[in-house]
């Protein structure tokens, strides 16, 4: 009778084991072991027992002890079970961002590991077990579906293998995959709201505001604002689940025409975009041209108004005839025209909006000087010793210099309060002088003496 010890062994891959082959007869003709494994016999006294060191055991094996005794030949097998933890435990790659409400399939691949009967694959969220299955196939694959929720944001998913050799007197060997950190997001189906001027004048600045509600996590949202090829640099303010991005936009003559204003919100692997057209226009103020800005009374003056070729102008409220970008009027300059404003209003239609521009010029009419009865009375009669203010106003442009003299030397204090005396009486020659010439007027002052009763 042949016996083997131990009859069952579990050992690590590549490991060694001592196997003893024994026989019940004292003088066996033959005693040995049959195995493809590298073996080394350890010398022992006696004939009925042999010990072998079997080395580099890579896979399960069943070495067989045999003996040949007088009463016949017999065999005994020992069962070598090799154990080893899996080579690779991996979660199939997934995009790190996942939309809330989507089903996420987690797939764990386990390469190798033995004995498979003792190997279990566990899918985890944090420390919570989602699925536990025996390892079957090569690679062993375990999948589970998770409905992505908001509160999964930042959760770590992993895969763990458990090689449980505790029933064999060994330990529980665990291998864990690299974690997959889930980042969940909500990007609403509604496009962002874009508030901006529909038209924008060259060499001016406009303000663009892009906003969106219902985002999660709002701090991770990227906002891209652009006008044509020009990237805008917005200032973004965040609410609980909303943001508002405000940017200043400057346009130049090169941008003239219809430009696309875009606001794109990128969150996770999704984006929402709003497009708007902005018309960039150039519209200089109309030009008011006077033949000369300063003319003498009686001169013929032409007032012209010229504007953008597509504009329509009115000059002093009178539309151009025919309606268009030019208007003019003719006038003979009178003193009343001095300081008169000529206002040109131009209207341009840009993208359905009416844009108004004005330009005003003032006409200076040179006239005078003038001294008349209304402003410079020819006769004053005042009681002696009364307080009076002689008034004489000369008119003209430029304003004339006025002097009133009696006998060529004695001045009348125009515009000053004086006490009337006999000396004041007499005829004065008032002379108004300017670059336009001079005029004179005689003014008589009568002084009434008091009556003594």
């Amino acid at each position: 009778q042949t016996s083997v010890s131990p009859s069952k062994v579990i050992l690590p891959r590549g490991g060694s084991v001592l196997v003893t082959c024994s026989t019940s007869c004292d003088q066996p003709k033959l005693l040995g072991i049959e195995t493809p494994l590298p073996k080394k016999e350890l010398l022992l006294p006696g004939n009925n027992r042999k010990v072998y060191e079997l080395s580099n055991v890579q896979e399960d094996s069943q070495p067989m002890c045999y003996s040949n005794c007088p009463d016949g030949q017999s065999t005994a097998k020992t069962f070598l079970t090799v154990y080893w933890t899996p080579e690779r435990v991996e979660l199939a790659p997934l995009p790190s961002w996942q939309p809330v409400g989507k089903n996420l399939t987690l797939r764990c691949q386990v390469e190798g590991g033995a004995p498979r009967a003792n190997l279990t694959v566990v899918l985890l969220r944090g420390e919570k077990e989602l699925k536990r299955e025996p390892a079957v196939g090569e690679p062993a694959e375990v999948t589970t579906t998770v409905l992505v929720r908001r509160d999964h944001h930042g959760a770590n998913f992993s895969c763990r293998t458990e090689l449980d050799l505790r029933p064999q007197g060994l330990e529980l060997f665990e291998n864990t995959s690299a974690p997959y950190q889930l980042q969940t997001f909500v990007l609403p189906a509604t496009p962002p709201q874009l508030v901006s001027p529909r038209v924008l004048e060259v060499d001016t600045q406009g303000t663009v505001v892009c906003s969106l509600d219902g985002l999660f996590p709002v701090s991770e949202a990227q906002v891209h604002l652009a006008l044509g090829d020009q990237r805008l640099n917005p200032t973004v303010t965040y609410g609980n689940d909303s943001f508002s991005a405000k940017a200043s936009v400057s346009v130049t003559a090169e941008d003239e025409g219809t430009q696309r204003l875009t606001c794109a919100v990128i969150l996770g692997n999704q984006s929402q975009e709003t497009l708007q057209t902005v018309t960039i226009y150039s519209f200089p103020a109309p030009n008011v041209i006077l033949t000369k800005p300063e003319v003498s009374e009686g001169t013929e003056v032409t007032v012209k108004c010229e504007a953008h070729p597509r504009a329509k102008v009115t000059l002093n409220g009178v539309p151009a005839q025919p309606l268009g970008p030019r208007a003019q009027l003719l006038l003979k300059a009178t003193p009343e025209d001095n300081g008169r404003s000529f206002s040109c209003s131009a209207t341009l239609e840009v993208a359905g909006q009416l844009i108004h521009k004005n330009q005003t010029r003032e006409l200076r009419v040179l006239y005078g000087p003038r001294l008349d009865e209304r402003d410079c009375p020819g006769n004053w009669t005042w009681p002696e010793n009364s307080q009076q203010t002689p008034m004489c106003q000369a008119w003209g442009n430029p304003l004339p210099e006025l002097k009133c003299l009696k006998d060529g030397t004695f001045p009348l204090p125009i515009g000053e309060s004086v006490t009337v005396t006999r000396d004041l009486e007499g005829t004065y020659l008032c002379r108004a002088r300017s670059t336009q010439g001079e005029v004179t007027r005689k003014v008589t002052v009568n002084v009434l003496s008091p009556r003594y009763e």
Epitope: Q58, E87, R88, V89, Q109, E111, G112, R116, V136, G137, E138, P139, E141, A178
Partner: antibody
Framework: QVQLQQSGAELVRPGVSVKISCKGS????????LHWVKQSHAKSLEWIGV????????DYNQKFRGKATMTVDKSSTTAYLELARLTSEDSAIHYC?????????????WGQGTALTVSS | DVVLTQTPLSLPVNLGDQASISCRSS???????????LHWYLQKAGQSPKLLIY???NRFSGVPDRFSGSGSGTDFTLKISRVEAEDLGVYFC?????????FGGGTKIKR
């Protein structure tokens, strides 16, 4: 004992397809994946791809995508490699080899190889 | 793809000599789990390749202990302490760290 028995040598004309087989025995067939390797004088050894004998999942070397198709029949413990639109470049010995799916412990047992000659 | 360069291409030996083959990788073969999936095969004339060493230094079942593997990162070596007649053939290194898996060009050990 572990054995991978491959189908015999093939002499085929350019432009056609050929399907070679690899039968596994002496082990639990679905416990190991099967890899296919091409050996030609010009390019030494080239890995074509791997098939899971359990699930039928495959991974190909990009170079052989569209050229090679790997399949498996669990019931007969046989894997197949089909090569399409053959040219003289496909003339080589094609081996199947047993391993873990990602080959982490090496290709421990190989078939005897199938010699493919493409000639008009 | 990862390129494995073997040197020398050919190695004449006397039986009983020590032989050494080098395999250099174009990038590190350390996988993210810390293991290095570099293996060695021997192909004798008219036969299919046979696995000798897996994961740099582990001898496969039935491989004599005169074969040893060493190295790390990008530089690896296979040593045969005393060459025997049955060791003659072409030796290939191979990597299973990066996809697609690749082989070295081979080193022929001859008498």
């Amino acid at each position: 004992q572990v054995q991978l028995q491959q189908s015999g040598a093939e002499l085929v004309r350019p432009g056609v397809s050929v399907k070679i087989s690899c039968k596994g025995s002496g082990y639990t067939f679905t416990d190991y994946a099967l890899h296919w390797v091409k050996q030609s004088h010009a390019k030494s050894l080239e890995w074509i791809g791997v098939i899971s004998t359990y699930s039928g999942n495959t991974d190909y070397n990009q170079k052989f995508r569209g050229k090679a198709t790997m399949t498996v029949d669990k019931s007969s413990t046989t894997a197949y490699l089909e090569l399409a639109r053959l040219t003289s470049e496909d003339s080589a010995i094609h081996y199947c080899a047993r391993s873990l799916y990602f080959g982490s412990s090496g290709f421990d047992y190989w078939g005897q190889g199938t010699a493919l000659t493409v000639s008009s | 793809d990862v390129v494995l360069t073997q040197t020398p291409l050919s190695l004449p030996v006397n039986l009983g000599d020590q032989a050494s083959i080098s395999c250099r990788s174009s990038q590190t073969l350390v996988y993210r789990n810390g293991n290095t999936y570099l293996h060695w095969y021997l192909q004798k004339a008219g036969q299919s390749p046979k696995l000798l060493i897996y994961k740099v230094s582990n001898r496969f079942s039935g491989v004599p202990d005169r074969f040893s593997g060493s190295g790390s990162g990008t530089d690896f070596t296979l040593k045969i302490s005393r060459v025997e007649a049955e060791d003659l053939g072409v030796y290939f290194c191979s990597q299973n760290t990066h996809f697609p898996y690749t082989f070295g060009g081979g080193t022929k050990i001859k008498r």
